[in-house]
Amino acid sequence: HKCDITLQEIIKTLNSLTEQKTLCTELTVTDIFAASKNTTEKETFCRAATVLRQFYSHHEKDTRCLGATAQQFHRHKQLIRFLKRLDRNLWGLAGLNSCPVKEANQSTLENFLERLKTIMREKYSKCSS
């Protein structure tokens, strides 16, 4: 069957987000991938979206991320814009209303996005073959 257009959009967004690192991609998030063996695919997408939502809700107005100049402010707005897009598309793919995120493990946002990209690319390769 054909790959969902939403999946393609997620991969495209992740490709952009992982092109470059920035100050706030080095901040930590809950690592839902550390022990996700008994988790369905839809739950994984839902939990990933939850983690991203927690991150941008918490850091959208974080002065460490906003920086001191218009240029730094633009960069942070760019990060938040892409994370919101990713969150929205992951919810669409998950099709679930809510899901718990209870893990204690942490990873940087940067590593979280890289891991999510790997998972999404694997899914894409299966549905496109």
């Epitope: 952009s16 987000l17 092109e19 690192k21 100049t69 240029q71 960069r75």
Partner: antibody
Framework: EVQLVESGGGLVQPGGSLRLSCAAS????????MHWVRQAPGKGLEWVVW????????TYADDFKGRFTFSLDNSKNTAYLQMNSLRAEDTAVYYC???????????WGQGTLVTVSS | EIVLTQSPATLSLSPGERATLSCKAS??????AAWYQQKPGQAPRLLIY???HRYTGIPARFSGSGSGTDFTLTISSLEPEDFAVYYC?????????FGQGTKVEIK
């Protein structure tokens, strides 16, 4: 594949005007900022302007405020640099460059030569 | 406007040697410094952004370091294709500015 193609350069007399175009392809145009950078013959790089492609808001280097206007046509994925009151010292290769998602300029066009001479 | 001063203007080295290029800013740009390589007749190419992060596809022999006002680009072992002009650039604040360039030439 990301591509930026400039056009519109050429010979113009002092005091004249020219409009440069930069056609972008291979990515979502409004996701990345766009810049113009110029390089006079045998000289270094000089940043001219950047534009937030989402809002259309440009930010100019002081030397170019008033004379140069950066605009977009998002439907054509194209950026324009309108240059008025051109002087001999504006003679340069003009590059458009895509702003990296956060930093720097990650893709550049091949450049278009503008020569201001009588 | 933040002025970037690069040194030396020209660096004459042989393939295999280590190249160290310096860039000094007139005021702090924190870590918002980038490096570009430009060869004759070509557009510049982004090598390093955010002081020390190699851009996609850039070989590991290129590295960046520094913070505040002093930045360094190091090429650990020069390859024939590395002989070019290198520019530092700050994107801490507008106007973005470039250094005047350092030419790395074959000795």
């Amino acid at each position: 594949e990301v591509q930026l193609v400039e056009s519109g350069g050429g010979l113009v007399q002092p005091g004249g005007s020219l409009r440069l175009s930069c056609a972008a392809s291979g990515y979502t145009f409004t996701d990345y900022s766009m810049h113009w950078v110029r390089q006079a013959p045998g000289k270094g790089l000089e940043w001219v302007v950047w534009i937030n492609t989402e809002t259309g808001e440009p930010t100019y280097a002081d030397d170019f405020k008033g004379r140069f206007t950066f605009s977009l046509d998002n439907s054509k994925n194209t950026a324009y640099l309108q240059m008025n009151s051109l002087r001999a010292e504006d003679t340069a290769v003009y590059y458009c460059a895509r702003g990296g998602i956060f930093y720097g300029m990650d893709y550049w066009g091949q450049g278009t030569l503008v020569t201001v001479s009588s | 406007e933040i002025v970037l001063t690069q040194s030396p203007a020209t660096l004459s080295l042989s393939p295999g040697e280590r190249a160290t290029l310096s860039c000094k800013a007139s005021q702090s740009v924190i870590n918002d410094a980038a490096w570009y390589q430009q060869k004759p007749g070509q557009a510049p190419r982004l090598l390093i952004y955010y002081t020390s992060h190699r851009y996609t596809g850039i070989p590991a022999r290129f590295s960046g370091s520094g913070s505040g006002t002093d930045f360094t680009l190091t090429i650990s072992s020069l390859e024939p294709e590395d002989f070019a002009v290198y520019y530092c650039q700050q994107d801490y604040t507008s106007p973005w500015t470039f250094g005047q360039g350092t030419k790395v030439e074959i000795k």
